[in-house]
Amino acid sequence: KESCDVQLYIKRQSYHSIFAGDPFKLECPVKYCAHRPQVTWCKLNGTTCVKLEGRHTSWKQEKNLSFFILHFEPVLPSDNGSYRCSANFLSAIIESHSTTLYVTDVKSASERPSKDEMASRPWLLYS
């Protein structure tokens, strides 16, 4: 898609398998033309996405894309769930697809499960 609209490049039904206690950066790739939009992260609670306030966020600039990053320092078990970024552009809100963080609490896991094992968790298949 080539346009001067803001575009948020989070894949639909994407997810990340991560571990409690590790640091993690959740990236929202943002494409814009002239002025960088205001971008925020929210966490889904049912059908409502609750804005994340007071969290460590940052921007990273690459050649054709900017990344609005939500930092987890470290990941907590309660960070499990689905997140969405949204951009405020010309008084309109552009929302990304949601992306799911599947957090394994290493205290309760004897070993770190593989990516395929993560994918087999039934609740995740319907996220």
Partner: antibody
Framework: EVQLVESGGGLVQPGGSLKLSCAAS????????MYWVRQASGKGLEWIGR????????RYAASFKGRATISADDSKNTAYLQLNSLKTEDTAVYYC????????????WGQGTLVTVSS | DIQMTQSPSSLSASVGDRVTITCRSS???????????LNWLQQKPGKAPKRLIY???KLDSGVPSRFSGSGSGTDFTLTISSLQPEDFATYYC?????????FGQGTKLEIK
């Protein structure tokens, strides 16, 4: 233009394995999801699974879990399907396909490769 | 798994006819983003399937405007307003809302 070229089909003995390749052009596969579907002669379409080439995460249909492995090599812009413990009923045309992970703006299928499982 | 049921399974029609194929899912295809991920494919003998319609009603580029899709929830239709000789093929619906992805059994459109 997005295009896919499959290879690796042919005759396989029962109990054997196959590894099919699917090379993409016209798109960076890291921006896509790639998936595999099979079709037995005269039958319908059966979804095997998919991969997110950006991180290697996979999903499988229950009937293929543990027997199929989908992988990708983004440096070669190629996805793979390995299927183990082959049975005669795995004889089919195997298709790979690719779609835009962000906007669903394209969904392109390969030409298909015939796998025959027979002794 | 979501069951996708197409009807009819085969259909004889003539060039110029208006044709409707229906697809019913065993549960709603409405995703959390408010969209229904229902696709229609066309497959000709010996060829790979080709997507015609996605998100219920969006036409892929290059697909003639005589093809249209509609529906919501669990009931969807593919309509060809005026059949052309190149439209005789098998048509499949399939859902991309939940895993595993599932296909209808196909509708074979034959020349009367």
């Amino acid at each position: 233009e997005v295009q896919l070229v499959e290879s690796g089909g042919g005759l396989v003995q029962p109990g054997g394995s196959l590894k099919l390749s699917c090379a993409a052009s016209g798109v960076n596969i890291k921006d896509t999801y790639m998936y595999w579907v099979r079709q037995a002669s005269g039958k319908g379409l059966e979804w095997i699974g998919r991969i997110d080439p950006a991180n290697g995460y996979t999903r499988y249909a229950a009937s293929f879990k543990g027997r199929a492995t989908i992988s990708a090599d983004d440096s070669k812009n190629t996805a793979y399907l390995q299927l183990n413990s082959l049975k005669t009923e795995d004889t089919a045309v195997y298709y790979c396909a690719v779609y835009d992970g962000y906007y669903e703006s394209f969904d392109v299928w390969g030409q298909g490769t015939l796998v025959t499982v027979s002794s | 798994d979501i069951q996708m049921t197409q009807s009819p399974s085969s259909l004889s029609a003539s060039v110029g006819d208006r044709v409707t194929i229906t697809c019913r899912s065993s549960q709603s295809l409405l995703d959390s983003d408010g969209k229904s991920y229902l696709n229609w494919l066309q497959q000709k003998p010996g060829k790979a399937p080709k997507r015609l319609i996605y998100l219920v009603s969006k036409l892929d580029s290059g697909v003639p405007s005589r093809f249209s899709g509609s529906g919501s929830g669990t009931d969807f239709t593919l309509t060809i307003s005026s059949l052309q000789p190149e439209d005789f093929a098998t048509y499949y619906c399939w859902q991309g809302t939940l895993f595993p992805r599932t296909f209808g059994q196909g509708t074979k459109l034959e020349i009367k």
